[in-house]
């Protein structure tokens, strides 16, 4: 058993049929010695008396808010949560496996630039009685500070018969130099509590590996005389690290109709303009990627050919 | 430590071309190592990230773009800063800093070159003959060093009398390649920045 936060405790259980469970001793936070009784949740049934209560925690029915009272007055609470371990593996029931970039990916993180600011998100099908708490650091043995905000519900989607909820959190490394060469990864730890179930999820990454620039901005077209060709130009996104001559991007320019199966024109360039062949009912799209370290491409920025 | 005196090429930069080749060569070599040594811990997640130039060169700091010298976090470990008179940069100072930057890059290349050559000598003794260093990568390191045009004492190649542990050598190769790729990215950014300046 360990303390998650004040008056909230996590009991780690090996989860299998007829498991013996864990013996837990609760102590009432009071100077009083006599006349103390214990109850669980909203029940008025007295579980025991005395300053300490010893319980055998085996299942979710044994978890919950234990309260010690004296003469009708509440003295203190202890909330017990369960953390299940099945076949030596901690349960991951609360969050959905996003399977990208690999199986057992519960947390996904992205950074728009090298400033040390990043966003992580996760998915769940659970809609109520759900709380998250996020901590982060650079390195684990001698951790350096990363500050994370509160996790918020950022999107709701319908997937078949199920509703899916996306939560996200923003974090910022306390003293980040965009030009630094990372040797210690960022660690992100998410505590998830659903009703009386506790789970924790972690992710470890270098900012350089989670970079995904915003799409290029200000796409403009200039038809070329006596030609089917069009000059398309654009600018670096505002959120990208500066100076741009140091943090350079490379671009992919594509002309395509509505369907992915349609024919297309595609060209890669390090410049902020390119010449392509425009077709009726097609769109010109441009996306960006770090020129020197190939992490993710940005989403497309598009304009119609017409 | 006395840094070699630079004569930076005013037409910046065959160095840009060579640094692009360097990044390409080390990325290809790393990809080849990951594929060939698939049963060894050779991915970014599996290896320890070591920097053989740590405390010996200061490339990131010496080559910091002017715009980032206002960022306190970038100046933490700087012995020398671009800033003079509260962020006013005299042109003499500029060329001095550029010389310092390029000489730091040269020292990095020299250290990696020695490590890679020593390692290659060990890998050539491996009866499995599983992996060797790409001669193209070694040649590209050499070309960039020549383009940087510094004179400094040659570092003798380390020779070891004991029987090499090929497993350890291959893991060390992965560690070295990962670190060198990161440094090659920095070098490419620096060359691109200097070229644009």
């Amino acid at each position: 058993i360990w303390e998650l936060k004040k008056d909230v405790y996590v009991v780690e259980l090996d989860w299998y049929p007829d498991a013996p469970g864990e013996m837990v001793v609760l102590t009432c936070d009071t100077p009083e010695e006599d006349g103390i009784t214990w109850t669980l949740d909203q029940s008025s049934e007295v579980l025991g008396s005395g300053k300490t209560l010893t319980i055998q925690v085996k299942e979710f029915g044994d978890a919950g808010q234990y309260t010690c009272h004296k003469g009708g007055e509440v003295l203190s609470h202890s909330l017990l949560l369960l953390h299940k371990k099945e076949d030596g593996i901690w349960s991951t029931d609360i969050l959905k496996d996003q399977k990208e970039p690999k199986n057992k990916t519960f947390l996904r993180c992205e950074a728009k630039n090298y400033s040390g600011r990043f966003t992580c998100w996760w998915l769940t099908t659970i809609s109520t009685d759900l709380t998250f708490s996020v901590k982060s650091s650079r390195g684990s043995s001698d951790p350096q500070g990363v500050t994370c905000g509160a996790a918020t519900l950022s999107a709701e989607r319908v997937r078949g018969d199920n509703k899916e909820y996306e939560y996200s959190v923003e974090c910022q490394e306390d003293s980040a130099c965009p030009a630094a060469e990372e040797s210690l990864p960022i660690e992100v730890m998410v505590d998830a509590v659903h009703k009386l179930k506790y789970e924790n999820y972690t992710s470890s990454f270098f900012i350089r590996d989670i970079i995904k620039p915003d799409p290029p901005k200000n796409l403009q077209l200039k038809p070329l005389k006596n030609s089917r060709q069009v000059e398309v130009s654009w600018e670096y996104p505002d959120t990208w690290s500066t100076p741009h001559s140091y943090f350079s991007l490379t671009f992919c320019v594509q002309v395509q109709g509505k369907s992915k199966r349609e024919k297309k024109d595609r060209v890669f360039t390090d410049k902020t303009s390119a010449t392509v062949i425009c077709r009726k009912n097609a769109s010109i799209s441009v996306r960006a990627q770090d020129r020197y370290y190939s992490s993710s491409w940005s989403e497309w920025a598009s304009v119609p050919c017409s | 430590r006395n840094l070699p005196v630079a004569t930076p090429d005013p037409g910046m930069f065959p160095c840009l071309h060579h640094s692009q080749n360097l990044l390409r060569a080390v990325s290809n070599m790393l990809q080849k190592a990951r594929q060939t040594l698939e049963f060894y811990p050779c991915t970014s997640e599996e290896i320890d990230h070591e920097d053989i130039t740590k405390d010996k060169t200061s490339t990131v700091e010496a080559c910091l773009p002017l715009e980032l010298t206002k960022n306190e976090s970038c100046l933490n470990s700087r012995e020398t800063s671009f800033i003079t008179n509260g962020s006013c940069l005299a042109s003499r100072k500029t060329s001095f800093m550029m010389a310092l930057c390029l000489s730091s890059i040269y020292e990095d290349l020299k250290m990696y070159q020695v490590e890679f050559k020593t390692m290659n000598a060990k890998l050539l003794m491996d009866p499995k003959r599983q992996i060797f260093l790409d001669q193209n990568m070694l040649a590209v390191i050499d070309e960039l060093m020549q383009a940087l045009n510094f004179n400094s004492e040659t570092v003798p190649q380390k020779s070891s009398l004991e029987e090499p542990d090929f497993y350890k050598t291959k893991i060390k190769l992965c560690i070295l390649l990962h670190a060198f790729r990161i440094r090659a990215v920095t070098i490419d950014r620096v060359m691109s920045y200097l070229n644009a300046s």
Partner: antibody, heavy 118, light 107 residues
């Protein structure tokens, strides 16, 4: 199986014209760009131009502008390349090639040898 | 027009040995470069597109690398069927242009 089948070899006199055909099978004809590339004996390849069979749009290499005409007949899934004012240096194997991507070629015809000789 | 220069023009190789062919562009073309294989009396066949992207059905011993002006086609271990002429082609701008070809011959 996508295939491009070209017309047979031709022998032409200098100053005349030649029209080579390229019949496509497999896949929808208008879903691909169609190019013509030539290769003179022992030489590298030269790109001549492309057509979008969907709308008849064409683009020609400056070297051949004014001498080459590329057309397409959607009803027969056939493209044509006509080269006029032939000279001896036009002796080459002419290939049609196609792709959904405009700028490179993933399927090629078998080639048509055009010999220009007096 | 962008000029593509291949080297060497002829490359004698022992079967089973690796081979590398170089292609240089007269100006930077990013990764807009493609490689073809041509055997005598046959049409070219696409091997690699956009400098390093492999084509399904093409053996994994063929790989491409490079960007900007310098590109390489590598055959990790030459098989008897790989003896042919190899061409690079740029697609950075029109007119599309090819290298003059590299003939890989049996040593």
């Amino acid at each position: 199986q996508v295939q491009l089948v070209q017309s047979g070899a031709e022998v032409k006199k200098p100053g005349s014209s030649v029209k080579v055909s390229c019949k496509a099978s497999g896949g929808t004809f208008s879903d691909y760009y169609l190019h013509w590339v030539r290769q003179a004996p022992g030489q590298g390849a030269e790109w001549m131009g492309w057509i979008d069979p969907e709308n008849g749009d064409t683009e020609y290499a400056p070297k051949f502008q004014g001498r080459v005409t590329i057309t397409a007949d959607e009803s027969t899934s056939t493209a044509y390349m006509e080269l006029s004012s032939l000279r001896s240096e036009d002796t080459a194997v002419y290939y049609c090639a196609r792709n959904k991507e405009l700028r490179y070629f993933d399927v090629w015809g078998q080639g048509t040898l055009v010999t220009v000789s007096s | 027009d962008i000029v593509m220069t291949q080297s060497p023009l002829s490359l004698p190789v022992t079967p089973g040995e690796p081979a590398s062919i170089s292609c240089r562009a007269s100006q930077s073309i990013s990764i807009n470069l493609h490689w073809y294989q041509q055997k005598p009396g046959q049409a070219p066949r696409l091997l690699i597109y956009f400098a390093s992207q492999s084509i399904s059905g093409v053996p994994s011993r063929f790989s491409g690398s490079g960007s900007g002006t310098d590109f390489t086609l590598t055959i990790s271990s030459l098989q008897p069927e790989d003896f042919a002429t190899y061409y690079c082609q740029q697609s950075n701008s029109f007119p599309l242009t090819f290298g003059q070809g590299t003939k890989v011959e049996i040593k």
